[in-house]
């Protein structure tokens, strides 16, 4: 039975320009985490592998940053970059546990973030 | 103490394959991964691959996936690396290293196992 | 692959002074770069790990520093146990590779 919640940073917005650091945690299990993907609709932004390490998407490599921990952070934000973005996390036993995280990037600098939410 | 002890020096001619060991102490064997690392002629060393004691699971730097095998006996808390098709340019000290889960650095390393590749 | 190119590959020095090793990847690996000592006939041993933070048991002589593609690894006051070849490692993400090394020998 999966009993983890992820924890993400919500509905979040940012400046045109500037960065975000996308942050998923996943709690209330024991399971063993083995690989976090990071995607934007449908496409892969990075994958962090706990044998393997890192790695981001060609297409993304130069907006794209690894950490803070199993975290992302995205740079030189353009308003294209507004959407959801998923954390999907491997674990052992109990499977995969997915977390949304809308982003809007805002012309102006009235960016503010949301407050925390939790999917089961 | 965390400890990697490996297997004693071998001497094999050219052609045929080699199996060293590397028998953990002091810690969960399932709870670190195992990596093999190449040192030849005590310059430089080359990841040779990695394998995950608790899911069985192998990653191979490209240049070493037609050398090594990598394997795991729990019983006895021991990582394998066979070598086959042995050439002289495999002559080198080989290290069995542990990483940590999402740690992608070697805080323990074995002893170190001398092959000798010669007919 | 990361290519891991380090320098000097050999300095000479004397106990007392302070050395700088350096180490440049092909390309960013923001801060996951390890560094190892190791000594004649014996194994690597882990120093520093995401390019600052010392291992277990290392005196605080080390230091390292560095992001993206530009590293160090400063030792304050050496001692005569310094001696010996460094490497360093990105820990970014497969394949792992090490610098060539540098040998720091006793002047």
């Known amino acids: 039975m999966m009993t983890g919640t992820i924890e993400t940073t919500g509905n979040i917005s940012a400046e045109k320009g500037g960065s975000i650091i996308l942050q998923c945690h996943l709690s209330s299990t024991t399971a063993q985490v083995t690989q976090v993907n990071w995607e934007q609709q449908d496409q892969l932004l990075a994958i962090c592998n706990a044998d393997l390490g890192w790695h981001i998407s060609p297409s993304f490599k130069d907006r794209v940053a690894p950490g803070p921990g199993l975290g992302l952070t995205l740079q030189s934000l353009t308003v294209n970059d507004t959407g959801e973005y998923f954390c999907i996390y491997h674990t052992y036993p109990d499977g995969t546990y997915t977390g949304r995280i809308f982003l809007e990037v805002l012309e102006s600098s009235v960016a503010e973030h949301g407050a925390r939410f939790q999917i089961p | 103490e965390f400890q990697l002890q490996q297997s004693g020096p071998e001497l094999v001619k050219p052609g045929a394959s080699v199996k060293i060991s590397c028998r953990a102490s002091?810690?969960?064997?399932?709870?670190?991964?195992m990596n093999w690392v190449q040192q030849t002629n005590g310059k430089s060393l080359e990841w040779i691959g990695v394998?995950?004691?608790?899911?069985?699971?192998?990653n191979y730097n490209q240049k070493f996936k037609d050398k090594a095998t990598l394997t795991v006996d729990h019983s006895s808390s021991a990582a394998y690396m066979q070598l086959n098709s042995l050439t002289s340019e495999d002559s080198a000290v080989y290290f069995c290293?542990?990483?940590?889960?999402?740690?992608?650095?070697?805080?323990?390393w074995g002893t170190g196992t001398t092959v000798t590749v010669s007919s | 692959d990361i290519q891991m190119t380090q320098s000097p590959a050999s300095l000479s020095a004397s106990v007392g002074e302070t050395v700088t090793i350096t180490c440049r990847a092909s390309?960013?690996?923001?801060?996951?770069l390890a560094w190892y000592q190791q000594k004649q006939g014996k194994s690597p041993q882990l120093l520093a790990y995401?390019?600052?933070t010392l291992a277990e048991g290392v005196p605080s002589r080390f230091s390292g520093s560095g992001s993206g593609t530009q590293f160090s690894l400063k030792i304050n006051s050496l001692q005569s146990e310094d001696f010996g070849i460094y490497y360093c490692?990105?820990?970014?993400?497969?394949?792992?590779?090490f610098g060539g090394g540098t040998k720091l020998e006793i002047k």
């Open positions: 390309e960013s690996i923001f801060s996951y």
């Open positions: 490692q990105h820990h970014f993400g497969v394949p792992w590779t």
């Open positions: 002091g810690y969960s064997f399932t709870a670190y991964s």
């Open positions: 290293a542990r990483n940590g889960n999402f740690a992608w650095y070697f805080d323990v």
């Open positions: 394998i995950n004691p608790k899911f069985g699971t192998i």
């Open positions: 995401n390019a600052e």
